[in-house]
């Protein structure tokens, strides 16, 4: 999922939904749909994002995000202060450096507001998760410098 | 090609039920939520539910709650639609319509099957 | 429910002319969620547009979306015969999905 700060219209596809999915809100439900998974990526130590698929929604739907570390003095529940959105709703969550400590269990749920006992909390170990990136420099790229993954070097040309 | 194809023409007696078949091919069928839309004769589109096969969880319109019910059969692809308790005033086309995977429009509609209630 | 009235009921026109059809929502409706569907005598509805703006894959850019809030608007630039039909719009931003009673272009 292809996550912004800005809001853009997105174009047509027919991509899947991978991940279930929000409890309606005029049907009589036999159970409660899970929540889109959250995956967490931390980038050189220097930010982390946290992104679910919010296309997996029914229908548009504002998720919250809340955090924590388990069993640690940063067991306090923080709230997202920096959402990233695509079509206009929330589908991640940008952590900057103070708020990633690393070496301890971060604890991340997601929240149907909508619907509060819809909610789904996940265990992440975040040294595994760390991605290292490379600066390109002004002559590769042709002019600006961009943050650039390893994964990505020998494509940063499309950039 | 990708495309949703539906059950053929039913006439029905008030009281009765049907059930309209929509077989999808092409695309991943659990992956995008199926939408069920009719339109009376000579009428406008009124959205009626969804599945989702990935998980069969189902949303109906608060009109057609207690009459409608959606369950699809994920091993032969296929989204069903049984409507109970049929009046002269569900004749109607009934389609099955694709959600978007990324964003919430119907982006690939089934032919429609005629729905025909009379006594 | 968010109800939507489109305008006019018919509009009579010839081929080459620019056709201008109005969709107005009862309450607000967030642009990426406005769509417009193309529907022909004994076919069911085809996308033309969603996100209030964007042209759907294979849509001939004579059509085009536009507005917000209450207020949108889907413009076919030069008529062609086959753009003679019957247009909706539809809301997809929240649940009841809903769409407008339809806008029927016929050939003058």
């Known amino acids: 999922l292809n996550t912004t700060i800005l809001t853009p219209n997105g174009n047509e596809d027919t991509t899947a939904d991978f991940f279930l999915t929000t409890m309606p809100t005029d049907s009589l439900s036999v159970s409660t749909l899970p929540l889109p998974e959250v995956q967490c990526f931390v980038f050189n130590v220097e930010y982390m994002n946290c992104t679910w698929n919010s296309s997996s929604e029914p229908q548009p739907t504002n998720l919250t995000l809340h955090y924590w570390y388990k069993n640690s003095d940063n067991d306090k529940v923080q709230k997202c202060s920096h959402y990233l959105f695509s079509e206009e709703i929330t589908s991640g969550c940008q952590l900057q450096k103070k708020e990633i400590h690393l070496y301890q269990t971060f604890v991340v749920q997601l929240q149907d507001p909508r619907e509060p006992r819809r909610q789904a909390t996940q265990m992440l170990k975040l040294q595994n998760l760390v991605i290292e990136q490379k600066l390109i420099s002004e002559e590769d790229l042709g002019g600006e410098q961009k943050l650039i993954s390893e994964e990505d070097l020998h494509h940063h040309h499309h950039h | 090609q990708v495309q949703l194809v539906q059950s053929g023409a039913e006439v029905k007696k008030p009281g009765a039920s049907v059930k309209v078949s929509c077989k999808a091919s092409?695309?991943?069928?659990?992956?995008?939520?199926m939408h069920w839309v009719r339109q009376a004769p000579g009428q406008g589109l009124e959205w009626m539910g969804w599945?989702?096969?990935?998980?069969?969880?189902?949303n109906y319109a608060k009109r057609f709650q207690g009459r409608v019910t959606m369950t699809r059969d994920t091993s032969i692809t296929t989204a069903y639609m049984e409507l109970i308790r049929l009046r002269s005033d569900d004749t109607a086309v009934y389609y099955c319509?694709?959600?978007?995977?990324?964003?919430?429009?119907?982006?690939?509609w089934g032919r429609g099957t005629l729905v025909t209630v009379s006594s | 429910e968010i109800v939507l009235t489109q305008s006019p009921g018919t509009l009579s026109l010839s081929p080459g002319e620019r056709a201008t059809l109005s969709c107005r929502a009862s309450?607000?409706?967030?642009?990426?969620?406005l769509a417009w569907y193309q529907q022909k005598p004994g076919q069911a509805p085809r996308l033309l547009i969603y996100?209030?703006?964007s042209r759907a894959t294979g849509i001939p850019d004579r059509f085009s979306g536009s507005g917000s809030g209450t207020d949108f608007t889907l413009t076919i630039s030069r008529l062609e015969p086959e753009d003679f039909a019957v247009y909706y719009c539809?809301?997809?931003?929240?649940?009841?999905?809903?769409f407008g009673q339809g806008t029927k272009v016929e050939i003058k």
């Open positions: 539809q809301q997809y931003g929240s649940s009841p999905w809903t």
């Open positions: 319509a694709r959600r978007s995977g990324r964003s919430w429009y119907f982006d690939l």
């Open positions: 996100g209030a703006s």
């Open positions: 309450q607000s409706v967030s642009s990426s969620y």
């Open positions: 092409g695309y991943t069928f659990t992956g995008h939520y």
């Open positions: 599945i989702y096969p990935h998980s069969g969880h189902t």
